[in-house]
Amino acid sequence: WPPPGTGDIIVQAPTQVPGFLGDSVTLPCYLQVPGMEETHVSQLTWSRHGESGSMAVFHQTQGPNYSEPKRLEFVAARLGTELRDASLRMFGLRVEDEGNYTCLFVTFPQGSRSVDIWLRVLAKPQNTAEVQKVQLTGKPVPVARCVSTGGRPPAHITWHSDLGGMPNTSQAPGFLSGTVTVTSLWILVPSSQVDGKSVTCKVEHESFEKPQLLTVNLTVYYPPEVSISGYDNNWYLSQNEATLTCDARSNPEPTGYNWSTTMGPLPPFAVAQGAQLLIRPVDKPINTTFICNVTNALGARQAELTVQVKEGPPSEPSGMSSN
């Protein structure tokens, strides 16, 4: 029933406001009055959808009244001032505070004007990622674990990996009511090639400015993988000494190297020095198969290499030594 032709007043407020569990939040609400327009505000009212009564009222003569005085406060409204700012502060946010709120101005001569605001109650999750140390199982097992604890809404976890595999993600109630803990496992068939490689857990949440990336270095325990190097099939009599190296990859590290031959102990011209075997010059041809046996906490593995020291043409002075 306002006079015809008048510009209208507008209640300005965001459609959605985020707030953090346990913190305080301000629900902003302002009355926008066009330049030539006159209005008089007598009451500010906040109510919540689905609940009876109003939660906060600011009355032109009675001042503020609250359904929960310790948790609510008009930010700017004061007795004796123009009531144009109905912004309301809520303290100690709880999960049950999430919902739709109506901010209402009782004005003259325009009548009541209101706007709805959705309050989102968020909880920022804490994120951790850890390796799941595994052995060679021959079947898919979790090799990394990423946990986003106490998020509201639940965090979204994804994995980035060049190693293959697949995620297994689950949710459980968080420590605080209404929060969620998300656990995601990265599952693959362990192999020695995976050991020491990394996968990345990416955690996304409304409360983060950008996704959090957590890198996990994988650990696969496996017995030694052994090979012998240093022989090039061109060893000749009367040449320098040569060296064979026992190359072992294992996790944990090898605890011991043992050299022998298929005939038993090492011949006098072969001297073991840990992972290396020193072959001294010989004066007659040999044809010997050397064995390197490597041990770690998970077991022992060995490799064999047959070495021939041949009579060579005198025109080839180089020979036995491959280093």
């Epitope: 029933w1 306002p2 006079p3 006159e38 209005t39 008089h40 007598s42 009451q43 009212t45 109510s47 009564g53 109003s54 009222v57 009355h59 032109q60 003569t61 009675q62 009244n65 109506t102 209402l104 009782v106 003259f108 001569p109 009548g111 009541s112 209101s114």
Partner: antibody, heavy 116, light 107 residues
Framework: EVQLVQSGSELKKPGASVKVSCKTS????????MHWVRQPHGKGLEWIGG????????SYNQRFKGRVTITVDKSTSTAYMELSSLRSEDTAVYYC?????????WGQGTLVTVSS | DIQMTQSPSAMSASVGDRVTITCKAS??????VAWYQQKPGQPPKALIY???YRYSGVPDRFSGSGSGTDFTLTISSLQAEDLAEYFC?????????FGQGTKLEIK
């Protein structure tokens, strides 16, 4: 102390006009909207309209179809309600009331009797 | 126009009784409802605003509740001086409208 003091009773003939005054004191006149409400004897309350003294902005109940005019005199902190084309059913006690969304202070009432 | 329907239109109760008066709006008025007490020969007196908030100086035996379309005024322990007529009023939209009143008598 907030006070709203209205003019005395009026006896009017049908078709005439009546102008009732409401002199205020005890508060800043221009900070509150002033409204008028009537009550026929033994009946309920009916809102007539209101005015904001500062801006002169008004709002009227359409039921009165342009018969009502509400004005103010800021210099004397007085509000006026004039009702024209009176008929017998306009016989009632007329109240001025300070508006705060609801009506927190009321005048003592002015009896307007319309009778031939 | 929004109709405000009060019930009962009249009632009698004894001192100390709990008295409840209801008011039903024909459409949603949020919490923009006031309650008034009118004693014989006097203007109305504001008791409650915004459906549930008591004016300063109003005894705490008077309480209001409700939102939307259904509202209640309760007198928790009736006193002799509460003999009066009670009105509800909506100020959600123009024209402002009142209930037809509830006349309260003391037995």
């Amino acid at each position: 102390e907030v006070q709203l003091v209205q003019s005395g009773s009026e006896l009017k003939k049908p078709g005439a006009s009546v102008k009732v005054s409401c002199k205020t004191s005890g508060y800043t006149f221009t900070e509150y909207t002033m409204h008028w409400v009537r009550q026929p004897h033994g009946k309920g309350l009916e809102w007539i309209g209101g005015i904001h003294p500062n801006s002169g902005g008004t709002s009227y109940n359409q039921r009165f179809k342009g018969r009502v005019t509400i004005t103010v005199d800021k210099s004397t902190s007085t509000a006026y309600m004039e009702l024209s084309s009176l008929r017998s059913e306009d016989t009632a006690v007329y109240y001025c009331a300070r508006w705060t969304g609801d009506f927190d202070y009321w005048g003592q009432g002015t009896l307007v009797t319309v009778s031939s | 126009d929004i109709q405000m329907t009060q019930s009962p239109s009249a009632m009698s109760a004894s001192v100390g009784d709990r008295v409840t008066i209801t008011c039903k709006a024909s459409q949603n008025v949020g919490t923009n409802v006031a309650w008034y007490q009118q004693k014989p020969g006097q203007p109305p007196k504001a008791l409650i605003y915004s459906a549930s908030y008591r004016y300063s100086g109003v005894p705490d035996r008077f309480s209001g509740s409700g939102s939307g379309t259904d509202f209640t005024l309760t007198i928790s322990s009736l006193q002799a001086e509460d003999l009066a007529e009670y009105f509800c009023q909506q100020y959600e939209s123009y024209p402002y409208t009142f209930g037809q009143g509830t006349k309260l008598e003391i037995k």
